[in-house]
């Protein structure tokens, strides 16, 4: 296992318990809540983290208007059911037998129903739009510097392959990061865009999931980039199925 052998910790996930109880007495780290052994050389899946938490081309005007099918996580925290690979199960239910279908990032994509609700497959979120507003600064950041810094962050801190960072848009004070990853593009060992986005979201909120690392210190040419608002939109490969009542509410 890649967890540090000397003190047996998990650098990429502090919501674990590590013990020298793996094969041959090696260090093994298990996610809180689920008990699943995690690979400490990469990001832990959002489902296991949530479970543990509860136990581009640059154009002139390039800000993206989220599509009508974009989902925002309005439901907040819940204790999810994860499959044996650590992914969200397509159907989630609460203690009162209210059920709903989720996408691969665990965001609800149907109306709530009862135990008879069927969710045939886990629908993949293939496009994530991270919408940030930064605190006022003396002047606007240089777009190409900002682009380079955010791409470096996702590559180095979250180990996300650069090809999945589709674009970085900037119109002061709004920054948008587009992550795209189709099922066919994601190879074995690739970090999932949903997991990278979740780690980024927690970092931005000052709730880093990394063990013992300092919080996120984002700087563009030495100038601190301080985020005051974050909105994340999720687009699925298959549009969500909500009743008209919700859409007109």
């Amino acid at each position: 296992h890649t967890a540090a052998q000397d003190n047996c910790t998990c650098p990429t996930n502090k919501m674990t318990v590590c013990s020298p109880d793996g094969p041959g007495g090696r260090c093994q780290c298990r996610a809180l809540g689920s008990g699943m052994a995690v690979d400490c050389s990469t990001l832990t899946s959002k489902c296991l983290l949530l479970k543990a938490r509860m136990s581009a081309p640059k154009n002139a005007r390039t800000l993206v208007r989220p599509s009508e099918h974009a989902l925002v996580d309005n439901d907040g925290l819940y204790d999810p059911d994860c499959d044996p690979e650590g992914r969200f199960k397509a159907r989630q239910c609460n203690q009162t037998s209210v059920c709903w279908c989720v996408n691969s990032v665990g965001v609800r994509r149907t109306d709530k129903g009862d135990l008879s609700l069927r969710c045939d497959e886990l629908v993949r979120t293939h496009h994530i739009l991270i919408d940030l507003r930064h605190r006022p600064t003396a002047g606007a950041f240089n777009h190409s510097d900002l682009d380079a810094e955010l791409r470096r962050l996702f590559r180095e801190r979250y180990r996300l392959h650069p090809k999945f960072v589709a674009a970085v848009h900037y119109e002061q004070p709004t920054i948008q990061i587009e992550l795209r990853q189709n099922t066919s593009q994601k190879a074995a060992g690739d970090v999932d865009i949903g997991d990278a986005a979740y780690y980024f979201e927690r970092d931005i909120k000052g709730e880093s999931l990394f063990q013992g690392r300092g919080g996120l210190d984002l700087r563009v040419r030495g100038e601190p980039l301080q985020v005051e608002r974050t909105l994340i939109y999720y687009l699925d490969e298959i549009p969500p199925k909500f009743s008209m009542k919700r859409l007109t509410a």
Epitope: S19, G22, G25, Q28, M36, A37, V38, D39, S55, P84
Partner: antibody
Framework: QVQLVQSGAEVKKPGASVKVSCKAS????????LGWVRQAPGQGLEWMGN????????NYNEKFKGRVTITADTSTSTAYMELSSLRSEDTAVYYC?????????WGQGTLVTVSS | DIVMTQSPDSLAVSAGERVTMNCKSS????????????LAWYQQKPGQPPKLLIY???TRESGVPDRFSGSGSGTDFTLTISSVQAEDVAVYYC?????????FGQGTKLEIK
């Protein structure tokens, strides 16, 4: 060598509680998960929950939630499993076991008999 | 919860024979992160606690005779005793320790003819 020594047999009335102890020796108590498993007469094995004594993280099998309490005293390297609101079907041998891929260490078992 | 189903429930063989018993899980026990199968086999004799034979589906615990071997991956697993001895009479349990709650199979009882 690693040893887990459990407390002696108990006879309890329905509705009562029982607390079984498990004293560990021969290893660093705080850095391994310790689980509790029960076995009713002539039946199979049933995992009840576990504890990581070093940080007191505890997991319970939903089947027993609300009735079972697992604790640990790191000063004496002893784990405890308390089961409340006992019923006749709780009559079983209760085992503590050090968990992990290569942790084949079990206590000798404690027979708890629930009878009116 | 992961459901573990063992087969057969019991079997009787002559000493020296080869025996196999199976364990099927309702969900995969293969951890994609480390490619380990979180499946253990235990032997339990009357009046004794279970004894660990195999962990990680195929790794023999130290001190366990090499006539015991484990195989399989994902959802289907097998425990093989290459040449059964009289002292192997016991109940054999498979266990998943992949996701909470850990679960056991109902057991396979081995007897000698």
């Amino acid at each position: 060598q690693v040893q887990l020594v459990q407390s002696g047999a108990e006879v309890k009335k329905p509705g009562a509680s029982v607390k079984v102890s498990c004293k560990a020796s021969g290893y660093t108590f705080t850095i391994y998960w310790l689980g509790w498993v029960r076995q009713a007469p002539g039946q199979g094995l049933e995992w009840m929950g576990n504890i990581f004594p070093g940080s007191a993280y505890i997991n319970y099998n939903e089947k027993f939630k609300g009735r079972v309490t697992i604790t640990a005293d790191t000063s004496t390297s002893t784990a405890y499993m308390e089961l409340s609101s006992l019923r006749s079907e709780d009559t079983a041998v209760y085992y503590c076991a050090r968990e992990g891929s290569n942790s084949g260490y079990w206590g000798q078992g404690t027979l708890v008999t629930v009878s009116s | 919860d992961i459901v573990m189903t063992q087969s057969p429930d019991s079997l009787a063989v002559s000493a020296g024979e080869r025996v196999t018993m199976n364990c099927k899980s309702s969900q995969s026990l293969l951890n994609s992160g480390n490619q380990q199968n979180y499946l253990a086999w235990y032997q339990q004799k009357p009046g004794q606690p279970p004894k660990l034979l195999i962990y990680g589906a195929s790794t023999r615990e130290s001190g366990v005779p090499d006539r015991f071997s484990g195989s399989g991956s994902g959802t289907d697993f097998t425990l093989t005793i290459s040449s059964v001895q009289a002292e192997d009479v016991a109940v054999y349990y498979c266990q998943s320790d992949h996701i909470y709650p850990y679960t056991f199979g109902q057991g396979t009882k081995l007897e000698i003819k």
